[in-house]
């Protein structure tokens, strides 16, 4: 069993703010209750639940730092999805702060891939055409590898 | 206060048998996951064997399965582990432990002190 | 089995000082924007005690100079400022495949 296995019954969370929890767990965008009775709505950009749950509290929405900008905002069943703003990424490395992406390439070299919100700019040697350091392109993952939870990532 | 009490631990030969208890309060147990967790003498934690609500969902790693057998009787909030055909690399300090479930079984919430089960040739 | 890498194995820290811990996984913990580690404490002769749930959720009574951050398979406690209460043995478990597994620990004594 792996995280991908999200429900004992794949059943649509119920809309009202209580219902009852199914072999004791509560739906995505719901906590269940200390009595264990109820399952209780998380606040619509308070917090949230992605997953079926026995949580006593739904988790505390993400606040978007500055030099970032909130891709998408928190529902009952979704965290914040934050970006780094143009002109800077966030390395697979130091994933908790955004960077300056370069300006430009060192001498001898020309750029082959722009500033992303994941990547740095691309620079290649002129005459080889290698690329200087390893350098990451991510493709946008398709509704498989969403529910997998994987995306392809290349390495030059 | 939530409040687990492990007993049932002790001495027990080389593939004999040994059946722990766990007593469990201030939580509604009838509601929550449950689980033993082990301490190794070298410190080295490992999950046994995790129960859902009701009974009807059980993981085990592949170390016990087949030997080991988790229970729960919510009537009397208790929680069991029947353990057979015991070896030397189950000598452990076991914990009864109220474990979150999130997606999956997740993290440890609560741990009770731990008994002791010691198997010896 | 995702197998859980601890360092360093113990670690020395003044008083007021801040201390570092790694945990690494074997593979990726992540889904749908979780991060599915966790953090707990252990002190000699007590059972362990959560600190952390998922990566950077700090467990209801667990004072603030507890921090978790991380993502993928690189996670890492931080302890600032650090206590004398705080020597003690902190243990990464992940949740996000069966089955659940610990890394080996990291010793925290105080200089």
């Known amino acids: 069993i792996t995280q991908q296995d999200l429900a004992p019954q794949q059943r649509a969370a119920p809309q009202q703010k209580r219902s009852s929890p199914s072999e004791g767990l509560c739906p995505p965008g719901h906590h269940i209750s200390e009595d264990g009775r109820d399952c209780i709505s998380c606040k619509y950009g308070q917090d949230y639940s992605t997953h079926w749950n026995d949580l006593l509290f739904c988790l505390r929405c993400t606040r978007c730092d500055s030099g970032e900008v909130e891709l998408s905002p928190c529902t009952t069943t979704r965290n914040t999805v934050c970006q780094c703003e143009e002109g800077t990424f966030r390395e697979e490395d130091s994933p908790e702060m955004c960077r300056k992406c370069r300006t430009g390439c060192p001498r001898g070299m020309v750029k082959v891939g722009d500033c992303t919100p994941w990547s740095d700019i691309e620079c290649v040697h002129k005459e080889s055409r290698t690329v200087a350091a390893p350098s990451v392109f991510i493709f946008p993952p398709s509704d498989e590898q969403l529910k997998s939870g994987t995306a392809s990532v290349v390495c030059l | 206060d939530v409040k687990l009490v492990e007993s049932g631990g002790g001495l027990v030969k080389l593939g004999g048998s040994l059946k722990l208890s766990c007593a469990a309060s201030?939580?509604?147990?009838?509601?929550?996951?449950m689980s033993w967790v082990r301490q190794t003498p070298e410190k080295r934690l490992e999950l046994v064997a995790a129960?859902?609500?009701?009974?009807?969902?059980?993981h085990y790693p592949d170390t016990v399965k087949g030997r080991f057998t988790i229970s729960r009787d919510n009537a009397k909030n208790t929680l069991y582990l029947q353990m057979s055909s015991l070896k030397s690399e189950d000598t452990a300090l076991y914990y009864c432990?109220?474990?979150?479930?999130?997606?999956?079984?997740?993290?440890?919430?609560?741990w009770g002190q731990g008994t002791l089960v010691t198997v010896s040739a | 089995n995702i197998v859980l890498t601890q360092s360093p194995a113990s670690l020395a820290v003044s008083l007021g000082q801040r201390a570092t811990m790694s945990c690494r996984a074997s593979?990726?913990?992540?889904?749908?924007?979780?991060?599915?580690m966790h953090w707990y404490q252990q002190k000699p002769g007590q059972p362990p005690k959560l600190l952390i749930y998922?990566?950077?959720n700090l467990e209801s009574g667990v004072p603030a100079r507890f921090s978790g951050s991380g993502s993928r398979t690189d996670f890492t406690l931080t302890i600032d400022p650090v206590e004398a209460d705080d020597a003690a043995t902190y243990y990464c478990?992940?949740?996000?495949?069966?089955?659940?597994?610990f890394g080996a620990g990291t010793k925290l004594d105080l200089k």
């Open positions: 432990t109220r474990l979150t479930y999130y997606g999956n079984p997740a993290w440890f919430a609560y």
């Open positions: 201030g939580l509604p147990f009838n509601s929550y996951y």
């Open positions: 129960i859902n609500s009701n009974g009807g969902r059980i």
């Open positions: 593979e990726s913990v992540d889904i749908y924007g979780n991060s599915f």
């Open positions: 998922l990566s950077s």
């Open positions: 478990q992940q949740s996000y495949e069966d089955p659940l597994t």
